[in-house]
Interface confidence: low
């Protein structure tokens, strides 16, 4: 393993694009550690404010975690000659708040991208597609990890965060080959309706630890390859017939539903019936009611129709405040 560090100071690396020379095949950027044998470059926890320009051509795995990159501009990794081998790029926890269109262009082998733990106030619709064409060239991405990328409330744009992420995922239909998508811990209240239809190759979808209340308008029908659907730790109250039928129709899926506040009233009857006969829910015997109070902690699988009643709605004249 060779390593290089700044000889002058530990100040953040400031790349100068104007003076950038074609990288030598074996050089290692300042403040980074490089292993040609492992095809890996690590520039970790070095407070870098820009992506180093002089990355070695052999790099296959690039770790740029724990820095202060702030903005990822278009062509942030474009080099001449290109970084043709770069397959895995980890930018997690690097204080990114803006990822612009075309940020990952000219990375023909990029299969895995991790942007987790960056407070993305702005994610360009063309961050992954690279262009604003209605159908762009397919992205080589197979795994996209976007856990905890929600910005603090005071940094949010006017538009919904869910909508911003969705726009980037569907732009140009570029992510048709995506197998894995992680969107955990993003405070999502809903999943925009058409997102999953544009991601037909998904095998693994993680939406855990969000604030999803309902899946009524979400369609899983196209996801015939889906193997894992993680919905733990959301705000789901009940799954309705349409969703149950779609999940049952997926040939390989395993669904994870732990730690949701299930409401065990008359609307839950179909879901309980389905749970008793389905094989798709992992750990279904752990699912318990949260509401109403009289049903708290009851196991869903142990309920019968007599348990699942709805309080009659009183006519207005009998209602009290």
């Amino acid at each position: 393993t060779s390593s290089a560090s700044s000889s002058s100071s530990s100040a953040p690396f400031l790349a100068s694009a104007a003076s950038a020379q074609p990288p030598l095949p074996d050089q290692c950027p300042a403040l980074c550690e490089c292993s040609e044998a492992a095809r890996t470059v690590k520039c970790v926890n070095r407070n870098l404010t820009e992506v180093p320009t002089d990355l070695p051509l052999y790099v296959r795995n690039l770790f740029l975690t724990g820095n202060q990159l702030a903005v990822l501009p278009a062509g942030a990794f474009a080099r001449r000659p290109p970084l043709a081998e770069l397959a895995a790029l980890n930018l997690s926890g690097s204080r990114l708040d803006e990822v612009r269109g075309g940020a990952f262009e000219h990375l023909p082998s990029l299969r895995q991208l991790d942007l987790s733990h960056n407070p993305l106030a702005y994610l360009s619709p063309f961050a992954f597609s690279g262009s604003n064409a209605s159908i762009s060239a397919p992205s080589p991405l197979v795994e996209l990890i976007l856990n905890h990328i929600v910005p603090p409330d005071d940094k949010r744009q006017n538009r919904s965060f869910e909508g911003m992420v969705a726009a980037a995922l569907v732009a140009g239909r570029a992510l048709q080959g995506l197998h894995l998508l992680e969107l955990a811990s993003n405070h999502f209240l809903y999943l925009p309706r058409d997102v999953l239809a544009q991601l037909p190759s998904l095998r693994y979808l993680d939406l855990s630890n969000n604030s999803l209340v309902s899946l009524t308008y979400v369609s899983f029908r196209n996801l015939t390859h889906l193997e894992s659907l993680h919905l733990e730790d959301n705000a789901l109250k009940v799954l309705h017939n349409g969703t149950l039928a779609e999940l049952q129709g997926l040939p390989h899926v395993r669904v994870f539903l732990d730690n949701n506040p299930w409401v065990c009233d008359c609307h839950m009857a179909d879901m309980v019936t389905w749970l008793k006969q389905t094989g798709v829910v992992q750990g279904k015997d752990r699912l318990t009611c949260a509401f109403p109070e009289k049903m708290r902690n009851r196991v869903l699988l142990e309920l019968n129709s007599a348990d699942l009643d709805c309080d009659p709605i009183l006519p207005p004249s009998l209602q009290t405040s």
Epitope: R203, T224, E227, S228, P251, H252, V253, F256, G279, Q282
Partner: antibody
Framework: EVQLEESGGGLVKPGGSLRLSCAAS????????MGWVRQACGKGLEWVSI???????YYATWAKGRFTISRDNSKNTLYLQMNSLRAEDTAVYYC???????????????WGRGTLVTVSS | GYDMTQSPSSVSASVGDRVTITCQAS??????LAWYQQKPGKAPKLLIY???DLASGVPSRFKGSGSGTEYTLTISSLQPEDFATYYC????????????FGGGTKVEIK
């Protein structure tokens, strides 16, 4: 009684092809995923392929491109077409039903007795 | 991905002994694991699925446990009919799998 019976095994030269069949009785194959598992003499079990209820297929990495799993629900039969056979494909090939309670790839709760495939010149 | 490593490859034990077999997955398989028993010249038999659920007709001396990447099959009191080879199998993913089964553990008479 639920039964699976494999057929089509035999001796084949390297580079040759063979088509295995698995006929089911006492079970409606269209309601289940089905798979093939093989076992070389004295060796362990090796997963080959699976076909879901909806005919989505998965293959072991080494089987992709050479083996093709298919089903004919009207005949209640599962197939495995094997091309470009090699000596290392010599094994007993089992057909098995994917359990209804299993996950993505699945578990196998009912097995046939197996059919022997020998690849040798 | 999802390679299964089983150990030990063989174990010698006596009737009444407690036997433990372990299986490690190269990635998290979320408890989607089965255990099979196979006797010479016979097809495998499903014992346990979803890491700890007993298949129909399987005696309660067989117990599965584990989560994540580490799983265990325990036979609490070995019976004469339990001498056989045992295999684990991940049921989680069919993508990029060389072999869904572990290498097997032969339980022999001491």
């Amino acid at each position: 009684e639920v039964q699976l019976e494999e057929s089509g095994g035999g001796l084949v030269k390297p580079g040759g092809s063979l088509r295995l069949s698995c006929a089911a009785s006492g079970i409606d194959l269209s309601s289940y995923g089905m798979g093939w598992v093989r076992q070389a003499c004295g060796k362990g079990l090796e997963w080959v392929s699976i076909i879901s209820r909806n005919s989505v297929t998965y293959y072991a990495t080494w089987a992709k491109g050479r083996f093709t799993i298919s089903r004919d629900n009207s005949k209640n039969t599962l197939y495995l077409q094997m091309n470009s056979l090699r000596a290392e494909d010599t094994a007993v090939y089992y057909c098995a039903r994917r359990a209804t309670y299993s996950g993505a790839l699945g578990y196998f709760d009912i097995w046939g007795r197996g059919t022997l495939v020998t690849v040798s010149s | 991905g999802y390679d299964m490593t089983q150990s030990p490859s063989s174990v010698s034990a006596s009737v009444g002994d407690r036997v433990t077999i372990t299986c490690q997955a190269s990635e998290n398989i979320y408890s989607t694991l089965a255990w099979y028993q196979q006797k010479p010249g016979k097809a495998p038999k499903l014992l346990i699925y979803d890491a700890f659920d007993l298949a129909s007709g399987v005696p309660s001396r067989f117990k599965g446990s584990g989560s994540g990447t580490e799983y265990t099959l325990t036979i609490s009191s070995l019976q004469p009919e339990d001498f056989a080879t045992y295999y684990c199998q991940q049921g989680y993913s069919g993508t990029n799998v060389d072999n869904a089964f572990g290498g097997g553990t032969k339980v022999e008479i001491k």
